[in-house]
């Protein structure tokens, strides 16, 4: 499986909200020996690999943002902790998965990373990602709301596997 | 905050089994891997192999098939180590060490030391 | 497997001084490497983390570099507490394996 991320640079005002996306490609076992382990952090564009570094999201670690469940199922994170700081986590039966940011400030401006395992019986874990850059804006060059710009075809597919 | 605790010192005869205990707290216990880790005395760290709780998945090193059982209750946060037929190259310090997928052991036990001897 | 090679079994400095420790996978490995420290009567401690980044809390003195096949551990300034035997591990596929581990002494 890839994981996509169709948008690639989202730009957004100070105080507004937005979600950021990726998608789970390609074939995806629904066995009952699959376990999908999806998370979020903060990274940066490493010489050699983007998202090897992981940093929290507003000091909540990937392991405090992960969601774990089977196939295509759909899940949310542990609503207190991560609604506390403005964040939330979440998967349908898609293979879409997301994290909402709340409020957004300067601060928040960065690469963040998703990461999908999959987790099998007897076999090596299975590991990718996707990155995208968060500019939060202020002031009068500010956009009124969210302006997302598409990931290119090669980007978007941008697959890291162990 | 993230913690390890795992039961205390083993002696044991040749031919016995024992059965060592790693539990886990301040974390979703579930969600990440449990890897056990033998040190002989004097010697480096060898993987004896991983336990994922929330499914029961586990991958073990070929070193230590047969000798290793690994099994995890998620009703107490624990997982268990049981080595089988113990010879005296079992003797070692075992360890527990939480794994997150796809990334490292960030979180290690204390050490059980075993014992085996005559 | 992947064998993880430590070519020193000993490092001996004093206090103060840069040391490094290098480490060199039989494959390539990519980033996925981390190094550990094992101080005496003590659990190991991960401190570096695909191959470079520093784990929470671990002083800015310790550094790692490399990729691919060959990786390297610093100590920019050695300090008495930092006696220790420190141990790579990669963690590109399993079996996870470690090196013998390079047990650093200081004069």
């Known amino acids: 499986f890839k994981v996509a991320t169709p948008y690639s640079l989202y730009v957004c005002p100070e105080g507004q909200n937005v979600t950021l996306t990726c998608r789970l490609l390609g074939p995806v076992d629904k066995g009952h020996d699959v376990t999908f382990y999806k998370t979020w952090y903060r990274s940066s564009r490493g010489e050699v690999q983007t998202c090897s570094e992981r940093r929290p999201i507003r000091n909540l670690t990937f392991q405090d943002l992960h969601l774990h469940h089977g196939g295509h199922q759909a899940a949310n994170t542990s609503h207190d902790l991560a609604q506390r700081h403005g964040l939330e986590s979440a998967s349908d039966h898609h293979g879409n998965f997301s994290i909402t940011m709340r409020n957004l400030t300067l601060l928040d401006s960065g690469l963040y990373c998703c990461l999908v395992v999959e987790i099998r019986h007897h076999h090596s874990e299975h590991r990718v990602h996707g990155a995208m850059e968060l500019q939060v804006q202020t002031g009068k060059d500010a956009p009124s709301n969210c302006v997302v710009y598409p990931s290119s075809s090669q980007d978007s597919e941008n697959i890291t596997a162990a | 905050q993230v913690q390890l605790q795992q039961s205390g010192a083993e002696l044991m005869k040749p031919g016995a089994s024992v059965k060592i205990s790693c539990k886990a707290t301040?974390?979703?216990?579930?969600?990440?891997?449990v890897e056990w880790v033998r040190q002989r005395p004097g010697h480096g760290l060898e993987w004896i192999g991983e336990?994922?709780?929330?499914?029961?998945?586990?991958h073990y090193n070929e070193k230590f098939k047969g000798k290793a059982t690994f099994t995890a209750d998620t009703s107490s946060n624990t997982a268990y180590l049981q080595l089988s037929s113990l010879t005296s190259d079992d003797s070692a310090v075992y360890y527990c060490a939480r794994r997150p997928p796809g990334w490292f052991f960030d979180v290690w036990g204390a050490g059980t030391t075993v014992t085996v001897s005559s | 497997d992947i064998v993880m090679t430590q070519s020193h079994k000993f490092m001996s400095t004093s206090v103060g001084d840069r040391v490094s420790i290098t480490c060199k996978a039989s494959q390539d490995v990519s980033t996925d490497v981390a190094w550990y420290q094992q101080k005496p009567g003590q659990s190991p401690k991960l401190l570096i983390y695909?191959?470079?980044y520093r784990y929470t809390g671990v002083p800015d003195r310790f550094t790692g570099s490399g990729s691919g096949t060959d990786f390297t551990f610093t100590i920019s300034s050695v300090q008495a507490e930092d006696l220790a035997v420190y141990y790579c591990?990669?963690?590109?596929?399993?079996?996870?394996?470690f090196g013998g581990g390079t047990k650093l002494e200081i004069k």
């Open positions: 336990i994922f709780p929330g499914s029961g998945s586990t």
């Open positions: 695909s191959a470079s």
């Open positions: 591990q990669q963690h590109y596929s399993t079996p996870w394996t």
């Open positions: 301040g974390y979703t216990f579930s969600s990440s891997w």
